[in-house]
Interface confidence: low
């Protein structure tokens, strides 16, 4: 994975929240849910009320990157999805408000959002080769690809 030092000179400025209260389903149609107080997992749900609802905030890069850079917040909370290292669970970081500017090691809060048809991918800005992923019998984590599932469907208007 790419070291933080490659990215430390890039500054990301918060623009606005671009999506509210959406659900993320992986390619096996498993929804992301709260495993416990600090991290997430995926499960096939009969009732989508149990799924985690996310908000997505957009950031603009000082590098004028063509990629869409986003932060993921659990709706109605002050918990933000934070990347660690490869095969490590993504964590939920508590912050009083959405960061106005992000740079350096704080880029573990940011993801490049890419869409291919109905498939959505979230690549860690801190680790550009790694994606938010689900893995059997494990937390939602960062992974480079199979056997982890890295593509998600966004289900909106579930509130």
């Amino acid at each position: 994975s790419a070291p933080f030092s490659f990215l430390s000179n890039v500054k990301y400025n918060f623009m606005r929240i671009i999506k509210y209260e959406f659900i993320l389903n992986d390619a096996l149609n498993q929804s992301i849910i709260r495993a416990n107080d600090q991290y997430l997992t995926a499960a096939a749900l009969h009732n989508l009320d149990e799924a985690v609802k996310f908000d997505m905030g957009a950031y603009k890069s000082s590098k004028d990157d063509a990629k869409i850079t986003v932060i993921l917040r659990i709706s109605k909370t002050q918990l933000y999805v934070t990347a660690q290292d490869e095969d490590q669970p993504v964590l939920l970081k508590e912050m009083p408000e959405i960061p106005k500017t992000i740079t350096g090691s704080e880029t573990n809060l940011l993801f490049f959002w890419e869409t291919h048809g109905t498939k959505n991918y979230f690549t860690s800005v801190a680790h550009p080769n790694l994606f938010i992923a689900t893995k059997q019998d494990y937390w939602v984590c960062l992974a480079g690809g199979p056997p982890s599932i890295t593509d998600f469907q966004i289900l909106e208007n579930q509130a």
Partner: antibody, heavy 122, light 107 residues
Framework: QIQLVQSGPELKKPGETVKISCKAS????????MNWVKQAPGKDLKRMAW????????TYADDFKGRFAFSLETSASTAYLQINNLKNEDTATYFC???????????????WGQGTSVTVSS | NIQMTQTTSSLSASLGDRVTISCRAS??????LNWYQQKPDGTVKLLIY???RLHSGVPSRFSGSGSGTDYSLTISNLEQEDIATYFC?????????FGGGTKLEIN
Amino acid sequence: QIQLVQSGPELKKPGETVKISCKASGYTFRNYGMNWVKQAPGKDLKRMAWINTYTGESTYADDFKGRFAFSLETSASTAYLQINNLKNEDTATYFCARGIYYYGSSYAMDYWGQGTSVTVSS
Amino acid sequence: NIQMTQTTSSLSASLGDRVTISCRASQDISNCLNWYQQKPDGTVKLLIYYTSRLHSGVPSRFSGSGSGTDYSLTISNLEQEDIATYFCQQGKTLPYAFGGGTKLEIN
């Protein structure tokens, strides 16, 4: 059953340092954040900080930045609160409390330690 | 920051009484309201979370209600062991403030 057991009462002089422990049992320590809450005599309960028991990272309330340090010994399922350069106004009972989000968004503290009384007096 | 107010700081009642303790938030907290009991020996327990849900092991004589900014805790049949101070707390936004507490005493 779930228990949080704190260290005993402390009597300190101004300028000294105190370190309080909170040992958790009955659940997976790294799955839940830990709070520290202050209750000064005759005052409200006040949440001082939340510590992520997976990373050890703390989020401090505004009034508790500077002289306060929160740490973990994960292998022993223990959280610590250290207060440096003690002042008279630090006289209080300090509680550790496990944090939990109900329904994904409503925060509560579902299990509490018995409290540790700290008295600062010259 | 959201402020929590418990206007009644102490309350006197008789065993067997129905007692209601109220709590007001300075803005809408969307039912993210918890109640805690602090016994005279200092021990604190969560009684009710998310306005009306009983925490495990809490007797059914305790109940909670409310919405928006106004919430209440009711003890339907007061027992000696309920003598304590009761605190509300909002769980909606940091720093998750507590109310000042209501001390419940026996007549």
